[in-house]
Interface confidence: low
C-alpha cells in the first residue's frame, strides 16, 4: 500500500519512542565515530520533521524516501571528511547508490575504546538523573560497536536494560542485583549480534536464495506441523524483514517484524502448538520469544521421503517444472523430519540432491541414475557427528580454557597470517561450543554445535574481509556458505608460512596483569600462546604445554611477590630464555 509520506507512515506505525530509538540506532550504525550528542541532535531534527509530516503528509519533502531523508541528514555532519575519510564521498552520490555506499563503509571492528563499566552507584545516579539519556546512550554504544545488530531486538535488550536498573537501583545490595543481569545482557547481546551478522552476510554475500534456503530449513525444523505453503509464506516475510534490517531500513524492518509476529500469533493453530505463551506477551517480548521458540513435535506417521523424492517416476518432471519450489519442498520435508540435524547439514544434503538431479535428469535413464541419491547423504551426516563426538570428548577431558587453547593452536597453525587478536577472539568463541552444546543429548548436539560454529566462523570471515591476509581464509569464507566449517576443519598446517621473528617485547609482562579479571588474564595468556605458535608453528603440543605451564607459574609467583614489577622484569627474562630453549627458538 502506497503512502504519501513514508516517514509519517512509519512514525504512526511505530510510535514516537520506537521511531526515535530506531533512527538513533540507524545513525549510530552508519556513523560509528560520531559523538553521542551529535547523533541525538540529528535524531531530534528528524523526529520534528516526521511530526510535521504526520500533521500534513503533503508538506514539503514529506514525500521523500527514508533513505533520502536520512542520507541528507547524515551528510550534514560537518566533520564527515576528517572523521570518516572516503566515506564522505558517499554524499556525492544519489540514492540508492548513496545508501549502498554507507552500507559498504560499515566497520565490523571499529576503532572504539572498550566499554568500561562504571561503579554501580555511579550508574544508578546517572539512571535516576536522566533515564531517557541513559537508555539512549546504551542504544548508541551498542549500535556503533555492532553495526549489524538486529535493531528491533536491540529495543528488546534496551527494555531489559531499563528493567534491570529500575529494579536493582532500589535494591539493598545494588551490585549483587545488577551485575549478574548486566553480564547476562552483555553475553546475550554479543551472541545476538553475531547471529544477525551471519544472516546479513548470508543475504549480502550469497544472495536471497541462500537466506531463504536457510530459513526454510530452520522454520521447517521449528514448525514441522505447518504446511509447506505456510512455511513458504513465513520464509518470504522473514526474508523481507532481514533484508530490510541488513540494508539499514530499520523502521520498515521493525514495522514488518511486528506484522510478522502478529500474523504468526493469529495463525498459530496452523503453525505450531508451542507459540501460546509467546503470543500472550507484549510486542518486543513476543517477537523475541517467537524467534527463540522450541521446536514443535513432529507429526506422527510422516511417510518415507523416498516415495516422493527418489521412487516416484515424476521426480524429474516435478523438478523441471519449478526447480526452486521442488527443492524447497525437499528441504522442508527433510528438515521437519530431522530436528537432530544442523541447518547447514540439511542445506548440504539439499545441495547434493540438487546436483544429482541436475546430472541425472539429463541422463538416458534418470531413475536409475538418482536411485541411490540418499546413500550419498550418509558420509555428509557422519562427518559432523564424528567431529562433534571427538571435540566433546576433548572438551570434557580438558575443560573450557584448555579446550580453547587447543583450538587456538589448531587454528593458528591452519591460518597463521590472521591477526593475533582475531585468532584469540575467534578461538575463544569456538571453544565455547563445548560448554554450550556438549551438555545436550545426542539429538540436540549437532544443531547446537554446527550452527553455532557457523556463526563464529562468520565472525572470522567478516573480520578477515576488512584486512585480508590469508588466501585460505578467503577461500573457505567465499566458496560456499554451508561448507565453511568443513572447509576450515579440513585445513592442515600451513606449510608455506614463514615463522615470525622472535620479539622479546611480545613476551614481556608487567604487574598490571595481576589486577586483571580471570577472563582478561586468560586472554593475555592466550595471546602469548598464539604468538608462540606464530614463532614456532612446528612446536609440539607437549612443548607448548610446558611453556604455558611455566608461564602460568611465573604469573602466579610474581603476583604474590612483594615487589611485583621487579619480579616480572627478572623472572620474565628467565622465562623467555627457558622458552626459547624449550622450543629451539
Amino acid at each position: 500500500d502506497a503512502h504519501k509520506s513514508e516517514v509519517a507512515h512509519r512514525f504512526k506505525d511505530l510510535g514516537e519512542e520506537n521511531f526515535k530509538a530506531l533512527v538513533l540506532i540507524a545513525f549510530a550504525q552508519y556513523l560509528q565515530q560520531c559523538p553521542f550528542e551529535d547523533h541525538v541532535k540529528l535524531v531530534n531534527e528528524v523526529t520534528e520533521f516526521a511530526k510535521t509530516c504526520v500533521a500534513d503528509e503533503s508538506a514539503e519533502n514529506c514525500d521523500k524516501s527514508l533513505h533520502t531523508l536520512f542520507g541528507d541528514k547524515l551528510c550534514t555532519v560537518a566533520t564527515l571528511r576528517e572523521t570518516y575519510g572516503e566515506m564522505a564521498d558517499c554524499c556525492a552520490k544519489q540514492e540508492p547508490e548513496r545508501n549502498e555506499c554507507f552500507l559498504q563503509h560499515k566497520d565490523d571492528n571499529p576503532n572504539l575504546p572498550r566499554l568500561v563499566r562504571p561503579e554501580v552507584d555511579v550508574m544508578c545516579t546517572a539512571f535516576h538523573d536522566n533515564e531517557e539519556t541513559f537508555l539512549k546512550k546504551y542504544l548508541y554504544e551498542i549500535a556503533r560497536r555492532h553495526p549489524y545488530f538486529y535493531a528491533p531486538e536491540l529495543l528488546f535488550f534496551a527494555k531489559r536494560y531499563k528493567a534491570a536498573f529500575t529494579e536493582c537501583c532500589q535494591a539493598a545490595d545494588k551490585a549483587a542485583c545488577l551485575l549478574p543481569k548486566l553480564d547476562e545482557l552483555r553475553d546475550e547481546g554479543k551472541a545476538s549480534s553475531a547471529k544477525q551478522r551471519l544472516k546479513c552476510a548470508s543475504l549480502q554475500k550469497f544472495g536471497e536464495r541462500a537466506f531463504k534456503a536457510w530459513a526454510v530449513a530452520r522454520l521447517s525444523q521449528r514448525f514441522p506441523k505447518a504446511e509447506f505453503a505456510e512455511v513458504s509464506k513465513l520464509v518470504t516475510d522473514l526474508t523481507k524483514v532481514h533484508t530490510e534490517c541488513c540494508h539499514g531500513d530499520l523502521l520498515e524492518c521493525a514495522d514488518d517484524r511486528a506484522d510478522l509476529a502478529k500474523y504468526i500469533c493469529e495463525n498459530q493453530d496452523s503453525i505450531s502448538s508451542k507459540l501460546k505463551e509467546c503470543c500472550e506477551k507484549p510486542l518486543l517480548e513476543k517477537s523475541h520469544c517467537i524467534a527463540e521458540v522450541e521446536n514443535d513435535e513432529m507429526p506422527a506417521d510422516l511417510p518415507s521421503l523416498a516415495a516422493d523424492f527418489v521412487e516416484s517416476k515424476d521426480v524429474c518432471k516435478n523438478y523441471a517444472e519449478a526447480k526452486d519450489v521442488f527443492l524447497g519442498m525437499f528441504l522442508y520435508e527433510y528438515a521437519r523430519r530431522h530436528p537432530d540435524y544442523s541447518v547447514v547439514l540439511l542445506l548440504r544434503l539439499a545441495k547434493t540432491y540438487e546436483t544429482t538431479l541436475e546430472k541425472c535428469c539429463a541422463a538416458a535413464d534418470p531413475h536409475e541414475c538418482y536411485a541411490k541419491v540418499f546413500d550419498e547423504f550418509k558420509p555428509l551426516v557422519e562427518e559432523p557427528q564424528n567431529l562433534i563426538k571427538q571435540n566433546c570428548e576433548l572438551f570434557e577431558q580438558l575443560g573450557e580454557y584448555k579446550f580453547q587453547n587447543a583450538l587456538l593452536v589448531r587454528y593458528t597453525k591452519k591460518v597463521p597470517q590472521v591477526s593475533t587478536p582475531t585468532l584469540v577472539e575467534v578461538s575463544r568463541n569456538l571453544g565455547k561450543v563445548g560448554s554450550k552444546c556438549c551438555k545436550h543429548p545426542e539429538a540436540k548436539r549437532m544443531p547446537c554445535a554446527e550452527d553455532y560454529l557457523s556463526v563464529v566462523l562468520n565472525q572470522l570471515c567478516v573480520l578477515h574481509e576488512k584486512t585480508p591476509v590469508s588466501d585460505r581464509v578467503t577461500k573457505c569464507c567465499t566458496e560456499s556458505l554451508v561448507n565453511r566449517r568443513p572447509c576450515f576443519s579440513a585445513l592442515e598446517v600451513d606449510e608455506t608460512y614463514v615463522p615470525k621473528e622472535f620479539n622479546a617485547e611480545t613476551f614481556t609482562f608487567h604487574a598490571d596483569i595481576c589486577t586483571l579479571s580471570e577472563k582478561e588474564r586468560q586472554i593475555k595468556k592466550q595471546t602469548a600462546l598464539v604468538e608462540l605458535v606464530k614463532h614456532k608453528p612446528k612446536a609440539t603440543k607437549e612443548q607448548l604445554k610446558a611453556v604455558m605451564d611455566d608461564f602460568a607459574a611465573f604469573v602466579e609467583k610474581c603476583c604474590k611477590a612483594d615487589d611485583k614489577e621487579t619480579c616480572f622484569a627478572e623472572e620474565g627474562k628467565k622465562l623467555v630464555a627457558a622458552s626459547q630453549a624449550a622450543l629451539g627458538l
Epitope: K212, S232, K240, A322, K323, V325
Partner: nanobody, 117 residues
C-alpha cells in the same frame, strides 16, 4: 503443470527500450519471488533482476542498475521487465524463473532480445 511464457523481445537500436512480460500459470504465483535471467551466446546464465513475492523487494545486477525495472502484477499472474537505454551487451535470451534460480523453472523458451544498429 508450471508454465512460464516470456514475450516482448525483439530487435532494437542502442538506447532503445523494450518491455518483457512473463505469464505464469500452474502454481501460486503470488507466493513466490521471481527472477529475470539472461543468457548470451557462449556465456553462462546471469540473473538480471529479482523481485519478492509481494513486489516490495527488488534486486538488480550492477550491469543493469538504473536502466532496468522489474515489477509484477499478482492479480494477472504476470512478471515484467522494463528495459531502457539498451546496449549491445544486453543482447541475450531472457527468461523468467521462480525464486532466484538461474536455471529455467518451466518449459518456456525465453524471449530473444537483440540490440544492434
Amino acid at each position: 503443470q508450471v508454465q512460464l511464457v516470456e514475450s516482448g523481445g525483439g530487435l532494437v537500436q542502442p538506447g532503445g527500450s523494450l518491455r518483457l512480460s512473463c505469464a505464469a500459470s500452474g502454481f501460486t504465483f503470488g507466493q513466490f519471488g521471481m527472477s529475470w535471467v539472461r543468457q548470451a551466446p557462449a556465456k553462462g546464465p546471469e540473473r538480471v533482476s529479482a523481485i519478492s513475492s509481494d513486489g516490495s523487494g527488488t534486486i538488480y545486477a550492477d550491469s543493469v542498475k538504473g536502466r532496468f525495472t522489474i515489477s509484477r502484477d499478482n492479480a494477472k499472474n504476470t512478471l515484467y521487465l522494463q528495459m531502457n537505454s539498451l546496449k549491445p551487451e544486453d543482447t541475450a535470451v531472457y527468461y523468467c524463473t521462480i525464486g532466484s534460480s538461474t536455471t529455467p523453472s518451466g518449459p518456456g523458451q525465453g524471449t530473444q532480445v537483440t540490440v544492434s544498429s
